[in-house]
């Protein structure tokens, strides 16, 4: 039997059973999540669940830019430092940069300071690039 690798939507990239879309549009966190959902296929702002996944994403984004933070699907909806992935994935892998927590910052971004391998929290209303993910 020939097993075909699933195809992703045009402009999205494939890695280990998932499709990822990097958007250089400027959206606050909730608008970014709505836009991800609008692409269908069960897409959400991306969950990042391993160092391997983080490294692949970081390498891809670095091909486009190295200075702008990017929204991912991690947020603190109750504002109690109880972080969760918007797609329902288990919050096990963590990659926070040193001084990232606290204050009124309840949405997570991939930080450009460490080549997108670490996360920082930020104010959810800020307009930034974003990363979507779905399983084809």
């Amino acid at each position: 039997d020939i097993i075909m690798r699933p195809s992703c939507a045009p402009g999205w990239f494939y890695h280990k059973s998932n499709c990822y879309g990097y958007f250089r549009k400027l959206r606050n966190w909730s608008d970014a999540e709505l836009e991800c959902q609008s692409y269908g296929n069960g897409a959400h702002l991306a969950s990042i669940l391993s160092l391997k996944e983080a490294s692949t994403i970081a390498e891809y984004i670095s091909g486009y830019q190295r200075s702008q933070p990017i929204w991912i699907g991690l947020h603190d909806p109750q504002k109690r430092q109880q972080w969760q992935w918007i797609d329902g994935a288990m919050y096990l892998y963590r990659s926070w940069s040193g001084k990232s927590m606290g204050g009124n910052k309840h949405c997570a971004e991939m930080s450009s300071n460490n080549n997108f391998l670490t996360w920082s929290s930020n104010e959810c209303n800020k307009r930034q690039h974003f990363l979507c993910k779905y399983r084809p």
Epitope: R24, K25, L26, S67, P69, G103, S111, N113, N122, R127
Partner: antibody, heavy 116, light 107 residues
């Protein structure tokens, strides 16, 4: 009340540099991005760049090619724009503006005149 | 960069008249557009955000509409205090870009 108070007018010689300040009050300074805009005499508005006061991350309009440097001082809730190697083309009114979810609030403007 | 083409560049209108100003983007900007009013010697003031959201405190005679590439600002019944220069701004992508402005004067 949300306010952005900019520094006063500047008269500088060609080749010099200048630092314009924008002091924010009435809101949490790190919670909103700040952008800067140039308005040459009788002309439209040009977006120079943006800074996130929370982490210092900047974005510049490539048209201005290294002319501006945006910084913040969180302790005084102040944003700065440094302009270098000034020429007569840099003579303009410069505005800072707080980027809101719904509406943007602007400073009163700083007039820069570059003349020998 | 996204180019914002604003028209007309200047216009005269009578008090009580309905006035419309348009902005056309060089690509779809997903309604991420604001309208500003600037009076002589003053800084711009936001009137409309997200193409059709009226800023608190702005008179209801101002309204915004549009989607995709085409947007407009309408003043339903012109008042004397409405004269000034109006600008659109797209904030869908970096760098943000402004329209060239529309100078509105009273006939």
């Amino acid at each position: 009340e949300i306010q952005l108070q900019q520094s006063g007018p500047e008269l500088v010689k060609p080749g010099a540099s200048v630092k314009v300040s924008c002091k924010a009050s009435g809101y949490a300074f790190t919670s909103y991005n700040m952008y800067w805009v140039k308005q040459s005499h009788g002309q439209s508005l040009e977006w120079i760049g943006r800074i996130d006061p929370h982490n210092g991350v900047t974005t510049y309009n490539q048209k201005f090619k290294g002319k501006p440097t945006l910084t913040v001082d969180r302790s005084s809730s102040t944003a700065f724009m440094h302009l270098n190697s000034l020429t007569s083309e840099d003579s303009a009114v410069y505005y800072c503006a707080r980027e809101g979810y719904d509406y943007d609030v602007w400073g009163q403007g700083t007039t820069l005149t570059v003349s020998s | 960069d996204i180019k914002m083409t604003q028209s007309p560049s200047s216009m005269y209108a009578s008090l009580g008249e309905r006035v419309s100003i348009t902005c056309k983007a060089s690509q779809d900007i997903n309604s991420f557009l604001s309208w500003f009013q600037q009076k002589p010697g003053k800084s711009p003031k936001t009137l409309i955000y997200r193409a059709n959201g009226l800023v608190d405190g702005v008179p209801s005679r101002f309204s915004g509409s549009g989607s995709g590439q085409d947007y407009s600002l309408t003043i339903s019944s012109l008042e004397y205090e409405d004269m000034g220069i109006y600008y659109c701004l797209q904030y869908d992508e970096f760098p943000y870009t402004f329209g060239g402005g529309t100078k509105l004067e009273i006939k």
